[in-house]
């Protein structure tokens, strides 16, 4: 039986959710007037890059779209992007697709996502509404790297 990705709405401690704006992900306040993305999450079967201390290796996609989160270096800086890719195509690959992989770690009731390609770089939202979801190596006051994964029916 083929595995299915788990579905979540994603929210931070300031009640910001992830929203698709064109082909970019931005953070916006939880509000009736905006439609948050449903995040698809599925574990990677290949253990080549695994590191249990950092968490489980997962692929992240946008439900209802052939879009997956992807890390690439732009002008020398690790950058978070969306790439046209079906999450199940990544899952069925025998070899781990490193740029699409994230370490998913639980910190209390929150989730943290660290790039496998760029260790020490985490998915983050800024404190300002409407800004893109990005990668940061600075966890703390100005960036939020802890997220709540809310079950959606």
């Amino acid at each position: 039986r083929e595995a299915a990705p788990k579905s979540y709405a994603i929210r931070d401690s300031r009640q910001m959710v992830w929203v698709l704006s064109g082909n970019s992900l931005i953070a916006a306040p939880l509000s009736r007037s905006i439609k948050p993305v449903t995040l698809h999450l599925i574990a990677c079967r290949d253990t080549e890059f695994s590191d249990k201390e950092k968490g489980n290796m997962v692929y992240l996609g946008i439900k209802g779209k052939d879009l997956c989160l992807f890390c690439a270096e732009i002008q020398g800086k690790p950058t978070l992007q969306l790439k046209e890719k079906n999450i199940m195509d990544l899952y069925v690959e025998k070899k781990a697709q490193k740029p699409f992989l994230f370490f998913h770690n639980k910190e209390g009731s929150t989730s943290v996502f660290q790039s496998v390609s760029y260790p020490g770089w985490f998915i983050a939202t800024s404190t300002t509404s409407g800004q893109p979801i990005f990668l940061t190596k600075e966890r703390g006051i100005t960036n939020n790297t802890n997220f709540y994964l809310d079950s959606v029916e």
Partner: antibody, heavy 122, light 111 residues
């Protein structure tokens, strides 16, 4: 249908700790995406949010009360509780518990308890 | 002092239209968090009247409507009735406080 009922002592002495419980019926306190809050209303005044706890166990407190407030959940009794320490006469109020759901009421409170009056006096 | 500002009182004659304003800031209403409105009849708990800026829960008459623009929101009541006499509160979320905020309340008197 979700219902909330506050309970606890109606009289608390100054400098002591106020303790209230909200019993949830018609649904589970651990149900996904719900948040549970405490709001108070001093006599003749407006509403003040004290703090909240959600289904993940995450707590959020009013910065002006944070040093004195603890909110917790007892899943076995389907209840959540408020503790407010070092009370003074200024804490005399009707205390309400209320709830909402993240992706349905969008940070509003759609179900409220009937409220309980707590008087701080020696 | 409340984070959201409302007029202390408004009044109107039966059948008239009244509006109640609610002014916030760039960290709450202006940051695009929703505004909710509550009606509190004398001696009772608040009741959700409008949620998500302009949506009525089932059972709330369509005489009540909400709107939002910039850092402000307003509640309108048309065809004023004696039973509308109550206190009305706006509420939103404030990211700088990481918490829920209320207006100071507005007492509506039906003349």
């Amino acid at each position: 249908e979700l219902q909330l009922q506050e309970s606890g002592p109606g009289l608390v002495k100054p400098s002591e700790t106020l303790s209230l419980t909200c019993t949830v019926s018609g649904g589970s306190i651990t149900a996904s995406n719900y948040y549970w809050g405490w709001i108070r209303q001093p006599p003749g005044k407006g509403l003040e949010w004290i703090g909240s706890i959600d289904y993940t166990g995450s707590t959020y407190y009013n910065p002006s009360l944070k040093s004195r407030v603890t909110i917790s959940v007892d899943t076995s009794k389907n209840q959540f509780s408020l503790k407010l320490s070092s009370v003074t006469a200024a804490d005399t109020a009707v205390y309400y518990c209320a709830t909402g759901k993240y992706y349905e009421t969008y940070l509003g409170f759609d179900v409220w308890g009937q409220g309980t009056l707590v008087t701080v006096s020696s | 002092e409340s984070v959201l500002t409302q007029p202390p009182s408004v009044s109107g004659a039966p059948g008239q239209r009244v509006t109640i304003s609610c002014t916030g800031s760039s960290s709450n209403i202006g940051a695009h968090y929703d505004v909710h409105w509550y009606q509190q009849l004398p001696g009772t708990a608040p009741k959700l009247l409008i949620y998500g800026n302009d949506n009525r829960p089932s059972g709330v008459p369509d005489r009540f409507s909400g709107s939002k623009s910039g850092t402000s929101a307003s509640l309108a009541i048309t065809g004023l009735q004696a039973e509308d006499e109550a206190d009305y509160y706006c509420q939103s979320y404030d990211y700088s406080l990481s918490g829920y905020v209320f207006g100071g309340g507005t007492k509506l008197t039906v003349l």
